[in-house]
Interface confidence: medium
């Protein structure tokens, strides 16, 4: 796994697709639908918590139309998640035994229908803007979670949220090293797939502690970091240390070597 030492880390491809148009929804802005599992366990969010989780990570809970558009663009995820209408669904392109749901062996978005708000699932979020820049930070000894928080703060930034990383990925951020995010997770964005970087599809990879794709990394373990600097704090070109101009896309990779 890129950028990792422990042999107990496992990655999920977490393929994410850009949604650019939805049939019957011509005004849907371009954006990214992504599966989100905050915290260490699967299926832990009530409907209200699911909405809050998306907001907390810089996104909103996805609509059925957005998930359908993502599915039609090739998005697949064998995890049930809340959507904005309080239904629980998941998109399956290649049906297989554990992921059949209500559609037998046919491809499609599986649905559990409207579920009681107290039941717990994962969530599908949608993010369509990045109001600032995400940058990759590292140093020789890398960072514990707290060190990453403090390092980003010392560079007039905060640790990036998962939603911000997905938004940056959709704008071209590609880094084959896992980095801390604000929710304590470890992820890395891949635009151009290559064998050493966790799969043959573009997407944001998530590093889990256990092979069943649960568990957060030990906060004292050392990794790289992804920081986020909001628009109001983004320096104009040439202001950043070393005079490196800010990328027009709002995405840049700063390799910080100061200790």
């Amino acid at each position: 796994t890129p950028g990792l030492g422990p042999a107990t880390a496992f990655t999920s491809e977490d393929l994410v697709v850009q949604v650019t148009a939805v049939p019957g929804q011509p005004h849907l802005p371009g954006g990214v639908v992504f599966h989100y599992r905050p915290g260490p366990t699967r299926y832990s969010l009530t409907f209200e918590e699911a909405q809050q989780a998306c907001l907390r990570t810089g996104a909103v809970i996805a609509s059925p139309e957005q998930l359908q558009a993502a599915y039609e663009a090739g998005y697949e995820q064998c995890d049930a998640g809340w959507l904005r209408d309080q239904t629980v669904r998941y998109p399956i392109v290649s049906p297989r035994t554990p992921c059949v749901g209500d559609k037998d062996s046919s491809p499609g978005v599986r649905t559990y229908g409207v579920r009681p708000s107290t039941e717990t699932y994962d969530v599908y979020c949608f993010v369509d803007r990045l109001e600032g820049e995400v940058f990759f930070a590292t140093r020789l000894e890398q960072f514990t979670f707290q060190e990453a928080l403090e390092f980003c703060e010392s560079h007039n930034a905060t640790l990036a949220t998962t939603g911000q990383l997905y938004a940056a990925w959709s704008r071209g951020l590609d880094k084959c090293y896992a980095g801390w995010l604000a929710d304590g997770s470890l992820r890395y964005p891949i635009v151009t797939p290559r064998p050493a970087c966790g799969g043959d599809k573009p997407g944001v990879r998530t590093v889990y502690l256990y092979p069943n794709q649960t568990g957060l990394p030990d906060p004292l373990s050392r990794h790289h970091a992804f920081c986020f600097r909001g628009i109001s704090a983004v320096p104009s070109p040439g202001e950043e240390e070393g005079g490196t101009p800010t990328s027009p896309s709002g995405v840049e990779e700063w390799i910080v070597t100061q200790v």
Epitope: P38, G39, P40, T41, S44, E48, E49, Q52, A53, L55, R56, T57, F145, L149, E150, C152, E153, T158, L159, T161, A182, D183, G184, L216, P219
Partner: nanobody, 123 residues
Framework: DVQLVESGGGLVQPGGSLRLSCVAS????????MGWFRQAPGKEREFVAA????????YYADSVKGRFTISRDNSKNTVYLQMNSLRPEDTAVYYC????????????????WGQGTLVTVSS
């Protein structure tokens, strides 16, 4: 919105212990990172400790590491700060804070604040 109410402060001798509690209103308590800050007379408010919404991660100011422990009970909408081996320099008003993400040590990045509870360490 989230309302935060701290309790548990008081007068304690050096080397003693106190446990602060912060109760949050609202059903979405478990969606927030929670933190403790403190402000001594004539000084700026400073970060003490924080905990992520799932309790998966805790982090501390260097000055309290090994002496203070932050924890939370989402079923009770409560976050705790267990303070051991207290020192005179720990004297301050302690504030509970909430944020949508664990945003670190800058107090301006936290969304909600309690009114504070006074801790005095003196013999």
């Amino acid at each position: 919105d989230v309302q935060l109410v701290e309790s548990g402060g008081g007068l304690v001798q050096p080397g003693g212990s106190l446990r602060l509690s912060c109760v949050a209103s609202g059903r979405t308590f478990s969606s927030y990172a929670m933190g403790w800050f403190r402000q001594a007379p004539g000084k700026e408010r400073e970060f003490v400790a924080a905990i992520t919404w799932s309790s998966a991660t805790t982090y501390y100011a260097d000055s309290v590491k090994g002496r203070f422990t932050i924890s939370r009970d989402n079923s009770k909408n409560t976050v705790y700060l267990q303070m051991n081996s207290l020192r005179p320099e720990d004297t301050a008003v302690y504030y509970c804070a909430a944020a949508r993400i664990p945003v670190g040590r800058r107090s301006e990045n936290w969304d909600y604040w309690g009114q504070g509870t006074l801790v005095t360490v003196s013999s």
